[in-house]
Structures are given as structure tokens and as C-alpha cells.
């Protein structure tokens, strides 16, 4: 079951998944000037059996100018720098990730990949939040959001995180020392506390799972 909407936005925070549940789809997006090869799949799919999960299909990009060839164009120095950053970060992420049953790791970057990764998450997916550079985390509970299904609808739980002030950023799980969060209040109370308004429906969007995609910055 795909999640109908995207995870909550927290001011001055970003989020990522440590691992992706089977059924997750990742769009094969290419950077400007490149396009998906004609025979290529439009997305990668996290699939698996009882012992191993992996991404089905591989994303491939080709130059928009080179109509009849899949020959890769040598990146310009600027692109090379960007590509290297992506590669390094991807390797760090892969090193950080634990092998969770029924989950795929972050897919490695592909040649001329777009800077944005568009995921279609499934019920049960967890994403983790951290404050951006220059902000520190105030925790009321776990800095994570889970896509869950209740009453036949999907929604993301509200992460118990506020980012404030000038200091070092907090870490995602698996990156150096994860910040210890103080004991949270019971869910019945925290759920009513987590936003400044008395909102149960956080940022609801009337969208169908066919049309809704979730975008995360990948750079």
C-alpha cells in the first residue's frame, strides 16, 4: 500500500530513510540535458524474498542530444564536483545502513542522475529527521515519522522535533552519536502537543496515490 502523502515538514530540518521497505519505488530521473534511455525502466523497485531485498531495474540516463546512443557524456568540471559529492555521500550512507529484513539500502547514484530523488513510499516506512546546519534539536520524543494506515487511510506520524538556535546539526541514526531523546510523554498527550495548533490532520492533501509523489533532496 503506497503512502498517499509526504512526511511532515519540520522547519529547519531535513529527513531521510535509513532503509526502504519492499514496495518502495524510486523514479529514474535524469539531470538537465539528459533523459532516461528509451528501453529503460521509469523507476526502480525495492523487491525481495525472505532472505534478501534489492532494487529491481537500473536507472540509466543518456544525453538528450545523443538520440540514438547510450554513450555517456563526460561531465563538465562543475558536474564532476557535484557527482563526486553525491558518490561520497552515498557511500557514507551505505556504510551507515544496517541490513533490515524486508528493506533495501539507499540505491547508489547512477550516471547523470538528477539532484532530486523522487520516492514513492509504502505503509510502514520510517524516515528520520535532523536539524539543518546551524540549528539544534529540541526533542519531545523520537525525531522520526512513520507512514501508517488506520481507518483505511494512510498518513505520517508527527515527528517530535523542533529545530532552534545556532549550533551543530543533530545526526541521523547510524551517523556518529545519535542524540538521546528525553523520555517522551504518552502518545495520547504528545500527539496533542506536537504542533502549535490543535491539529490532528497535519498537512492533509486531497490526492490519490496514483498522482502523489514524494520528493527528497539528494545532493
Amino acid at each position: 500500500e503506497l503512502c498517499d502523502d509526504d512526511p511532515p515538514k519540520i522547519t529547519h530540518a531535513t529527513f531521510k530513510a535509513v532503509a526502504y521497505k519492499e514496495g518502495t519505488m524510486l523514479n529514474c530521473e535524469c539531470k538537465r540535458g539528459f533523459r532516461r534511455i528509451k528501453s529503460g525502466s521509469p523507476y526502480m523497485l525495492c523487491t525481495g524474498n525472505s532472505s534478501h531485498s534489492s532494487w529491481d531495474n537500473q536507472c540509466q540516463c543518456t544525453s538528450s542530444a545523443a538520440r540514438n546512443t547510450t554513450k555517456q557524456v563526460t561531465p563538465q568540471p562543475e558536474e564532476q564536483k557535484e557527482r563526486k559529492t553525491t558518490e561520497m555521500q552515498s557511500q557514507m550512507q551505505l556504510a551507515d545502513q544496517v541490513s533490515l529484513p524486508g528493506h533495501c539500502r539507499e540505491p547508489p547514484p547512477w550516471e547523470n542522475e538528477a539532484t532530486e530523488r523522487i520516492y514513492h513510499f509504502v505503509v510502514g516506512q520510517t524516515v528520520y529527521y535532523q536539524c539543518v546546519q546551524g540549528y539544534r534539536a529540541l526533542h519531545r520524543g523520537p525525531a522520526e515519522s512513520v507512514c501508517k494506515m488506520t481507518h483505511g487511510k494512510t498518513r505520517w506520524t508527527q515527528p517530535q522535533l523542533i529545530c532552534t538556535g545556532e549550533t551543530e546539526p543533530s545526526q541521523f541514526p547510524g551517523e556518529e552519536e545519535p542524540q538521546a531523546s528525553p523520555d517522551g510523554l504518552p502518545e495520547s498527550e504528545t500527539s496533542r502537543l506536537v504542533t502549535t495548533t490543535d491539529f490532528r490532520i497535519q498537512t492533509e492533501v486531497a490526492a490519490t496515490m496514483e498522482t502523489f509523489i514524494f520528493t527528497t533532496e539528494y545532493q
Partner: antibody, heavy 118, light 106 residues
Framework: QVQLVQSGAEVKKPGASLKVSCKAS????????MHWVRQAPGQGLEWMGW????????RYAQKFQGRVTVTRDTSISTAYMELSRLRSDDTAVYYC???????????WGQGTMVIVSS | DIQMTQSPSTLSASVGDRVTITCRAS??????LAWYQQKPGKAPKLLIY???SLESGVPSRFSGSESGTEFTLTISSLQPDDFATYYC????????FGQGTKVEIK
């Protein structure tokens, strides 16, 4: 304090339509889903459907598809449940209920008794 | 549809008794189960949500537990105010309720 106040009891003839209102107060109406549940005399609880009070998105139980319509008017913080082509077995108390922090129904209306009889 | 089988349908007990009511789901519902108390002529009142979380303001003598697809509501020491009908509700898929358990005075 949170309150859900429903419209009064009604007597309807078979084939007629019914519209029950549920006025919410004491909380941000558009921040919560509203559900409708009914209970026939001496029977158990039966879920009918829900509405997202913010977007207006709605879902209905299979049993009531095509007969039930749930709407809301955010300007007056009121949800409505309309049931058409009434039959005698639609005689029941109809409740609106707010879906709360734990995803269960934390506040209920007082109920609206509806008798369908010729 | 997910079916909820609640037992017993009627339970005779005395003040001070420990009472347990069981609800079995026809398939996995994670922990998306609630318990309600209803008195004649009144709307149901939420006691437990998410299988074991106690709703605010509900006495601690009420507790919920789960084991797979079987869920239990326990009243540790029955009080005069607890004689009522109790319903379980699954809300993983579209909501369905158990048939109810009437707790009456022995």
C-alpha cells in the same frame, strides 16, 4: 471543552432520505477526521464512514456505498451524514465521532435517534 | 472485511472481581485496536487505544494487551460504575467493531 452536538430525533418513512448534523466546538474542526457510526436497537456498533474535515476527502463502508453521503461546512464547524432510500432496518441511533490522537474515537456526539416506519 | 470476534457476549461478575474480555481479529491489525465502554442510552466512551494505551482520564484499573491477533481488556478490580457493555474496534482497515460484551452484576 470538546463537544459534538447532533441534531434531534427523526421519524422517517421508507424510501425517504435522512440528514443528521454534528456541530463541533472546543477544538479546531478542520484538524480532525469525523466518523459516523450507527447502532440499531439492542445491537452493536456499525461504522459508516469518515470525512477529512480539512480537505473534504471521504470514505464509506462497503455496505453503505451509494446510499450514504458525508459532507462538512467548515464555516460553521459542522459535519453532516445523509442516508438515502431508507428502510426499516435503518432504524438506529446515529453517532458522529471525532478521530483523536490515538486514531480511535475520543469524542462522540450524543446520538440521533432515527425511526424508519410506514 | 476484517471480522472482530468478541467473547464472552455476557459476563456476570461481582464488585472487586478481575474481569477479562477478549477480542480476536480475523487477520493482522498491527496494534490498531480500541476498547469502548457504553452505558444504556449513552454514547460509547473510549477506554483504550492502540491495544494498550490508556485514554486520558480513564482509571488505571482498565488495561489492554495483545498477543498476535488476540486482544484483551482487563478490569483489575471491578467497580459499581463498570457494569456496562464493552466493545472492541479494529481500525487498521476500515473500522469494524466486536459484537459487544455485557458485564452484569452476578
Amino acid at each position: 471543552q470538546v463537544q459534538l452536538v447532533q441534531s434531534g430525533a427523526e421519524v422517517k418513512k421508507p424510501g425517504a432520505s435522512l440528514k443528521v448534523s454534528c456541530k463541533a466546538s472546543g477544538y479546531t474542526f478542520t484538524g480532525y477526521y469525523m466518523h459516523w457510526v450507527r447502532q440499531a436497537p439492542g445491537q452493536g456498533l456499525e461504522w459508516m464512514g469518515w470525512i477529512n474535515s480539512n480537505s473534504g476527502d471521504k470514505r464509506y463502508a462497503q455496505k453503505f456505498q451509494g446510499r450514504v453521503t458525508v459532507t462538512r461546512d467548515t464555516s460553521i464547524s459542522t459535519a453532516y451524514m445523509e442516508l438515502s432510500r431508507l428502510r426499516s432496518d435503518d432504524t438506529a441511533v446515529y453517532y458522529c465521532a471525532r478521530e483523536g490522537a490515538g486514531d480511535a474515537f475520543d469524542f462522540w456526539g450524543q446520538g440521533t435517534m432515527v425511526i424508519v416506519s410506514s | 472485511d476484517i471480522q472482530m470476534t468478541q467473547s464472552p457476549s455476557t459476563l456476570s461478575a461481582s464488585v472487586g472481581d478481575r474481569v477479562t474480555i477478549t477480542c480476536r481479529a480475523s487477520q493482522s491489525i498491527s496494534s490498531w485496536l480500541a476498547w469502548y465502554q457504553q452505558k444504556p442510552g449513552k454514547a460509547p466512551k473510549l477506554l483504550i487505544y492502540k491495544a494498550s494505551s490508556l485514554e486520558s482520564g480513564v482509571p488505571s484499573r482498565f488495561s489492554g494487551s495483545e498477543s498476535g491477533t488476540e486482544f484483551t481488556l482487563t478490569i483489575s478490580s471491578l467497580q459499581p460504575d463498570d457494569f456496562a457493555t464493552y466493545y472492541c474496534q479494529q481500525y487498521n482497515s476500515y473500522s469494524t467493531f466486536g459484537q459487544g460484551t455485557k458485564v452484569e452484576i452476578k
